[in-house]
Interface confidence: low
């Protein structure tokens, strides 16, 4: 018994005065606690606890289940204990079959012995199977067998406590070890869509998928910069032992513009946290925004091709698209397609393919698009660049030489005089009058220019050249004339087209 200095409270004394007592099944257990301030006896084994306020604990016919720790406590809270083994050859183990172990921690297989004098107290695999090679354990007859550093691989391991009795191996009831995995990585979180665009009154629903090794992972939906608790629903599955999946679905049944914002799905475990966000934009009504991919004023050479391309945002989805020219709708030559196959895509592309454009095909080309809420349009002004064409070249009754040319951009007309039979006309002649004839008309067709010179200025035989040119090319017309005495011969015009 412990000895203490006089004056200090001392723990109670127990008779018999030993730490362990072995009795046979059916025998009497008689324990006496001596202390002036006796309070109670407490008996503990596995999860069972009994109390007795008598200072003498008597069990007339001991059973194996009376094996355990008997503790006497006094009013000072000081105590003394004796451990009693009730030896029963038919019941060598007391068992609590629940067996849970946390990965990397120790866990106790609770199979205390009723007889401390049996030998080879250990663990054995079920049905003759060997235990995992790396499984280490420490036996304690009063508590059970401690498995050291539980591994994930031990999950669902079936085992028995075992002792040798009279040369034979005796097994306890079987235990199935359930391993609770340790978190060795942050949860994996993903969201059904990264962004949502809705009209007022539509339902917003987004699902966050959380994956981890066990269901004890924590998860929640949060609104950024807000503490409001969001309503969410859960579904969960165990795909095998250490593969847990939870789906947390957040729903706003009738979204409003002020619900717009960033929503975060947050998950954490003892290792760390992870999050993923989704953006909600709620608009009061739908919209269409058109972005031309080329300049809306287009210059193209005669006979060449041009593609008119627009990108547009449409929400809700576009319902009608068309390209129009001169009040006529194109039935072909155009295509319309989503910019991406992403489910949340709102951006589209429309292309009109104009091929081998003629000078007469310039004008306004309009793209129109509509959805259930709005209409929108964009116009392209297409100018077809054409080489000048000399429409008329005449000597007028008043003696003027007149040249009329058409083309786009507006042609310039220069006049040249070639004396005698020279092929090259170099001396330029200033026109008397220059007019753009149809400048008040539509701006997309060819522009017509008229230029006149006074033929009376010419005193010698020769050729007069009218040359019309612009950025695209040039064309010439010629007037041949000769003097007979004092009179000019009839002037014979002819043209020479210069590429």
């Amino acid at each position: 018994q412990p000895s203490v200095s006089p004056g200090e409270p001392s723990p109670p004394s127990i008779h018999p005065g030993k730490s362990d007592l072995i009795v046979r099944v059916g025998d009497e257990i008689r324990l006496l606690c001596t202390d002036p301030g006796f309070v109670k006896w407490t008996f503990e084994i596995l999860d069972e606890t009994n109390e007795n306020k008598q200072n003498e604990w008597i069990t007339e016919k001991a059973e194996a289940t009376n094996t355990g720790k008997y503790t006497c406590t006094n009013k000072h809270g000081l105590s003394n204990s004796i451990y009693v083994f009730v030896r029963d050859p038919a019941k060598l183990f007391l068992v609590d079959r629940s067996l849970y172990g946390k990965e990397d921690n120790d866990t106790l297989v609770r199979c205390p012995l009723t007889d401390p004098e049996v030998t080879n107290y250990s663990l054995k695999g079920c049905q003759g199977k060997p235990l995992p090679k790396d499984l280490r354990f420490i036996p304690d007859p009063k508590a059970g067998i401690m498995i050291k550093s539980v591994k994930r691989a031990y999950h669902r391991l079936c085992l028995h406590c075992s002792v040798d009795q009279e040369g034979k191996s005796v097994l306890s009831e079987k235990f199935i070890l359930k391993v609770r995995p340790a978190f060795k990585a942050v949860p994996v979180v993903s969201v059904s869509k990264a962004s949502y665009l809705l009209r007022e009154g539509e339902e917003f629903t987004v699902t966050c998928t959380i994956k981890d090794v066990s269901s004890s992972v924590y998860s929640t939906w949060k609104r950024e910069n807000s503490q409001t608790k969001l309503q969410e629903k859960y579904n969960s599955w165990h795909h095998g032992d250490f593969n847990y999946e939870r789906q947390a679905t957040l729903t706003i049944s009738s979204a409003r513009v002020n619900d717009s914002g960033v929503f975060m799905c947050y998950a954490n475990n003892t290792f760390g946290s992870a999050n993923v966000t989704t953006t909600l934009e709620v608009v009061d009504k739908g919209f269409i925004n058109i972005f031309p991919m080329i300049n809306t004023t287009v210059f193209v050479n005669d006979g060449e091709n041009v593609d008119l391309i627009v990108e547009y945002e449409a929400f809700p989805k576009p319902e009608h698209q068309q390209w129009i020219y001169m009040n006529r709708t194109f039935t072909d030559k155009w295509e319309d397609y989503p910019k991406s196959e992403n489910e949340s895509n709102i951006r589209y592309v429309s292309e009109l393919h104009l091929t081998r454009l003629k000078g007469t095909e310039g004008g306004t080309y309009t793209f129109l698009v509509s959805n259930s809420d709005v209409n929108a349009a964009i116009a392209f002004n297409v100018y077809v660049n054409t080489k000048p064409e000399i429409l008329t070249y005449d000597r007028l009754v008043n003696g003027m030489l007149q040249c009329v040319a058409a083309g786009f951009p507006e042609p310039t007309i220069d006049w040249y005089f070639c004396p005698g039979t020279e092929q090259r006309c170099s001396a330029s002649v200033l026109p008397v009058d220059v007019q753009t004839l149809n400048s008040s008309g539509p701006p997309f067709g060819k522009l017509v220019v008229q230029s006149s010179i006074d033929s009376s200025a010419f005193k010698h035989n020769g050729t007069v050249e009218c040359k019309a040119y612009n950025d695209v090319g040039k064309t010439s017309a010629y007037f041949n004339f000769a003097f007979k005495g004092n009179n000019k011969e009839q002037i014979h015009p002819h043209t020479l087209f210069t590429p």
Partner: antibody, heavy 122, light 106 residues
Framework: EVRLVESEGGLVQPRSSMKLSCTAS????????MAWVRQVPEKGLEWVAN????????YYLDSLKSRFIISRDNAKNILYLQMSSLKSEDTATYYC???????????????WGTGTTVTVSS | DIQMTQTTSSLSASLGDRVTISCRAS??????LNWYQQKPDGTVKLLIY???RLQSGVPSRFSGSGSGTDYSLTISNLEQEDIATYFC????????FGGGTKLEIK
């Protein structure tokens, strides 16, 4: 769901052979002892044979030891019973059963198949 | 070999009755006794193992008792679904079954 499903039995001639199989699902087949138990029409149950988890130990009813062979394929989750030199008294419903145990060497059969009927007759 | 005897081959009882079925072993089987239920369609189910331990999923109206060579199965409140044949089985030395007791409704 833990299930044991025996193969189709049938009618066989005396002195011929037959192999029964039992497909297990819903549990780790290789963790359990397995057994065959039979029932003669309108009679009681009779244990036929047992096999340990990896097939290294087998046990038979003495009177059947020379004619019946129990085996297993853990990769396929199948238990077999090869019966040879069949006699009319082997006519019975044959059940496949899973063995579990309590304590040291004390056995019980905790999951049973639905049984398959073997008729030995000329 | 250990022989198992169920002296009562058939038994009639009314719904709600307390029914006891007995089984005797030819030698001491150290409580290594199990009870099985076989329904009319041939389906076999474990009810009780190690004399008195109830298999999971079995209704608590079933109980077992006994020691040495004499054992019994009790159904405390007979229900329609309990109509079946009941077999005892020893697990002391290899495995052997009793002849069965067929339970019928009066």
């Amino acid at each position: 769901e833990v299930r044991l499903v025996e193969s189709e039995g049938g009618l066989v001639q005396p002195r011929s052979s037959m192999k029964l199989s039992c497909t297990a699902s819903g549990f780790t087949f290789s963790d359990y002892y397995m057994a065959w138990v039979r029932q003669v029409p309108e009679k009681g149950l009779e244990w036929v044979a047992n096999i340990n988890y990896d097939g290294s130990s087998t046990y038979y009813l003495d009177s059947l030891k020379s004619r019946f062979i129990i085996s297993r394929d853990n990769a396929k989750n199948i238990l077999y019973l090869q019966m040879s030199s069949l006699k009319s008294e082997d006519t019975a419903t044959y059940y496949c059963a899973r063995g579990d145990y309590y304590g040291t060497t004390y056995w019980y059969f905790d999951v049973w198949g639905t049984g398959t009927t073997v008729t030995v007759s000329s | 070999d250990i022989q198992m005897t169920q002296t009562t081959s058939s038994l009639s009882a009314s719904l709600g009755d307390r029914v006891t079925i007995s089984c005797r072993a030819s030698q001491d089987i150290s409580n290594y006794l199990n009870w099985y239920q076989q329904k009319p369609d041939g389906t076999v189910k474990l009810l009780i193992y190690y004399t008195s331990r109830l298999q999971s999923g079995v209704p608590s109206r079933f109980s077992g008792s006994g020691s040495g060579t004499d054992y019994s199965l009790t159904i405390s409140n007979l229900e329609q679904e309990d109509i079946a044949t009941y077999f005892c089985q020893q697990g002391k030395k290899l495995w052997s079954f009793g002849g069965g007791t067929k339970l019928e409704i009066k």
